[in-house]
Amino acid sequence: GIAIPRNSGCPNSEDKNFPRTVMVNLNIHNRNTSTNPKRSSDYYNRSTSPWNLHRNEDPERYPSVIWEAKCRHLGCVKADGNVDYHMNSVPIQQEILVLRREPRHCPNSFRLEKILVSVGCTCVTPIVHHVA
Amino acid sequence: GIAIPRNSGCPNSEDKNFPRTVMVNLNIHNRNTSTNPKRSSDYYNRSTSPWNLHRNEDPERYPSVIWEAKCRHLGCVKADGNVDYHMNSVPIQQEILVLRREPRHCPNSFRLEKILVSVGCTCVTPIVHHVA
């Protein structure tokens, strides 16, 4: 097997709980986190399962702004603009990694957290449960 | 903006580029990744804009496996199962954070990276460009 050398070029950790506490470089490629998804596409308006985007802001979290999709209708929009309740608008969810300040208000100490966000909506055929 | 106090209980940072490099506690909340509500839906099959999930694997990244949605059709599926090409299936994209070891093989040093993933597909009315 490969024995990984404790590289002299590696940041050193004095933390007793090492490696539970690590250094993370936030100098991200493509760092503009709060890009409003409305700007990148208008699918949220043109979809047969349209959604509204709600700004979820938390200064104790990185990224501090996350956009949450909320489906506008229970049903799906037909070509004539009316809602078809024989179909369902449902949120598409994605689990994402975020950093949360811990202890709170410490500028350079974070905890890794997983959260579930709704990214947009899609129109699905409902599951019909037949009663025997 | 919020002025974050330099809390005496906070870990100290000697980094000149602070807060570009931060300390992260890896005791993740919701570590139990295998109990993901998102995993249990079959919207990808039941959607009027169904999609297939393709594996994007990178052993030097966490998460090592990310699933990319690829819309099955250019159009959207009608109630009779046929595809309506007057409508478009389009991918809904989301920017997510991933962790990458940097320098490689350093056990306590990571870099946060942003990647754009397609989470699922939605059915939209096409934009019609009229020629003068």
């Epitope: 097997g1 490969i2 990984i4 490696p19 539970r20 | 890896l26 993740i28 570590r31 139990n32 990744t33 295998s34 109990t35 993901n36 995993r39 249990s40 839906s41 079959d42 990808y44 099959n45 999930l53 594996r55 694997e57 990178d58 052993p59 030097e60 990244r61 966490y62 998460p63 090592s64 496996v65 699933w67 962790l99 070891r101 093989h105 056990p107």
Partner: antibody, heavy 117, light 106 residues
Framework: QVQLVQSGAEVKKPGSSVKVSCKAS????????ISWVRQAPGQGLEWMGS????????NYAQKFQGRVTITADESTSTAYMELSSLRSEDTAVYYC??????????WGQGTLVTVSS | DIQMTQSPSSLSASVGDRVTITCRAS??????LNWYQQKPGKAPKLLIY???SLQSGVPSRFSGSGSGTDFTLTISSLQPEDFAVYYC????????FGQGTKVEIK
């Protein structure tokens, strides 16, 4: 090509503990989890728990909670599974497997643990 | 825990036969279903992941289908090296395996 090489067979007394090792050769652990799966003689497969060596995150099956401890040493690319308070029904082949958190794509050769008085 | 039920528990078939094994989950698991092959004294081998994706290096005679609660593994033309035990496994929740299906020579 990733290979997982496990430690040799063990014979243990009831009430004792066993620690099985799993060494990744031909590559590091990378960012995958390592899961432990056991198989009693003539029986099916049973997942016990997992660890992500990069972070030290562990996740245990309810059934083994409190009795199993999974650890990893990145410097030697080795994962360990320790099972305590052994009983005869723990006699099984114990496998480690590389776990993408979606499937197990590489497996160790297995370690037979026999619990007998 | 999500229970996985395979059927049949064993089957006899001849070389060249088309073989189908089914797996049912006690609740919906989307497509998070894998299939493994295990030969006597050996570790399991991943054949199919995410219900229908063929793992690299696995012959194309193996295919998987299904979504939600019902899944199928098909071997289109059984070869001598395919006689083994086959397991389904879900990863929608903490992993659980089916009880196995033994494919024997007729």
């Amino acid at each position: 090509q990733v290979q997982l090489v496990q430690s040799g067979a063990e014979v243990k007394k009831p009430g004792s503990s066993v620690k099985v090792s799993c060494k990744a050769s031909g590559g590091t652990f990378s960012s995958y989890a390592i899961s432990w799966v056991r198989q009693a003689p003539g029986q099916g497969l049973e997942w016990m728990g997992s660890i992500i060596p990069w972070f030290g995150w562990t996740n245990y099956a309810q059934k083994f909670q409190g009795r199993v401890t999974i650890t990893a040493d990145e410097s030697t690319s080795t994962a360990y599974m320790e099972l305590s308070s052994l009983r005869s029904e723990d006699t099984a082949v114990y496998y480690c497997a590389r776990d993408s958190e979606y499937y197990f794509d590489h497996w160790g050769q297995g370690t037979l643990v026999t619990v007998s008085s | 825990d999500i229970q996985m039920t395979q059927s049949p528990s064993s089957l006899s078939a001849s070389v060249g036969d088309r073989v189908t094994i089914t797996c049912r989950a006690s609740q919906g698991i989307s497509n998070w279903l894998n299939w493994y092959q295990q030969k006597p004294g050996k570790a399991p081998k991943l054949l199919i992941y995410a219900a229908s994706s063929l793992q690299s290096g696995v012959p194309s005679r193996f295919s998987g289908s299904g979504s939600g609660t019902d899944f199928t593994l098909t071997i289109s033309s059984l070869q001598p090296e395919d006689f083994a035990v086959y397991y389904c496994q879900q990863y929608s929740d903490d992993p659980t395996f089916g009880q196995g299906t033994k494919v024997e020579i007729k």
